[in-house]
């Protein structure tokens, strides 16, 4: 399976809300002993591998923001903790999963990563990730609403396969 990032860049005005999205592509094993762990975190474009380092999003770690379920089931994070920080991550039945960030500030600018771990109990974990940039702008040059820029189909950094 693969993870695709429909948009590689989000440019938003300060104070706006944004939903960053990843999509699970390809065949998904729905076997009894296969489960999925999905989460979000901030990172940097490291020399070794993009999305390797896991930094918190608004002080919430990837452990706090994770989703867990089998296959394409719907799920969302623990509401209380995330919503206190203006965050909510969710996934649907179609392989889409997202994180919504409310009331953006300049400090929210940076690289965001979604991580999917396919857990095959008794065998191994397969991890795939997607990366996208968020730019929060202020002042007269800032857009009135979020502007999104599609990922190029050749951008291997935004689609990784197990």
């Amino acid at each position: 399976f693969k993870v695709a990032t429909p948009y590689s860049l989000y440019v938003c005005p300060e104070g706006q809300n944004v939903t960053l999205t990843c999509r699970l592509l390809g065949p998904v094993d729905k076997g009894h002993d296969v489960t999925f762990y999905k989460t979000w975190y901030r990172s940097s474009r490291g020399e070794v591998q993009t999305c390797s380092e896991r930094r918190p999003i608004r002080n919430l770690t990837f452990q706090d923001l994770h989703l867990h379920h089998g296959g394409h089931q719907a799920a969302n994070t623990s509401h209380d903790l995330a919503q206190r920080h203006g965050l909510e991550s969710a996934s649907d039945h179609h392989g889409n999963f997202s994180i919504t960030m409310r009331n953006l500030t300049l400090l929210d600018s940076g690289l965001y990563c979604c991580l999917v771990v396919e857990i095959r109990h008794h065998h191994s974990e397969h991890r795939v990730h997607g990366a996208m940039e968020l730019q929060v702008q202020t002042g007269k040059d800032a857009p009135s609403n979020c502007v999104v820029y599609p990922s190029s189909s050749q951008d291997s950094e935004n689609i990784t396969a197990a």
Partner: antibody, heavy 117, light 107 residues
């Protein structure tokens, strides 16, 4: 802050079953892998197995025939049973939280179990 | 199962010196390797995940490197509290395995 605490008898007779419980406090047990790891005196660490929040288990093949790990989410506890113990099973037993695609990030303080008649 | 071999078994150094610990895997583990520190009577503590990323709260003097089968944990300048046993651990597949450990002792 999630904390783990092992409990159970410190002395078990040969051929009997070792039973330990790990209590998870300060967080939810309904996610992650919940693992048992042991360390014989003066030796290294050995992963025994885990139970996933969904109930799926995975055991070290070297111990699989003797190990059972179970979970009681209502009590925020998971348990280890190791049957037919011998002196070679004498060790400090740790419970730990293992994050998928990450590491053992939280450990109990460990409990010493001696197998002796 | 994947066997992790750590060397040296014991490293005798003085505070302020640089410590270089090695972990070699019997087959490639990509970069799915963690390092732990264990002091006497205590549980292990996570230092490094995914070969080179420091866990939360770990001082910058600890660094990890390597991929595939050869990995290194470096302590740039040993502090008194760094004298302990260090273990590597792979998670590319199960069973999860640990190295035999390297003891860093005061010279």
């Amino acid at each position: 802050q999630v904390q783990l605490q092992e409990s159970g008898p410190g002395l078990v007779k040969p051929s009997e079953t070792l039973s330990l419980t790990c209590t998870v406090s300060g967080g939810s047990i309904s996610s992650y892998y919940w693992s048992w790891i042991r360390q014989p005196p003066g030796k290294g660490l050995e992963w025994i197995g885990y139970i996933y929040h969904s109930g799926s288990t995975n055991y070290n093949p070297s111990l699989k025939s003797r190990v059972t790990i179970s979970v009681d989410t209502s009590k925020s506890q998971f348990s280890l049973k190791l049957s037919s113990v011998t002196a070679a099973d004498t060790a400090v037993y740790y419970c730990a939280r293992d994050i998928p695609a990450f590491a053992f990030d939280i450990w109990g303080q460990g409990t010493m179990v001696i197998v002796s008649s | 199962e994947i066997v992790l071999t750590q060397s040296p078994a014991t490293l005798s150094l003085s505070p302020g010196e640089r410590a270089t610990l090695s972990c070699r895997a019997s087959q490639s583990v990509s970069y799915y390797l963690a390092w732990y520190q264990q002091k006497p009577g205590q549980a292990p503590r996570l230092l490094i995940y995914d070969a080179f990323n420091r866990a939360t709260g770990i001082p910058a003097r600890f660094s990890g490197s390597g991929s595939g089968t050869d990995f290194t944990l470096t302590i740039s300048s040993l502090e008194p509290e760094d004298f302990a046993v260090y273990y590597c651990q792979q998670r590319i597949n199960w069973p999860l395995t640990f190295g035999g450990g390297t003891k860093v002792e005061i010279k």
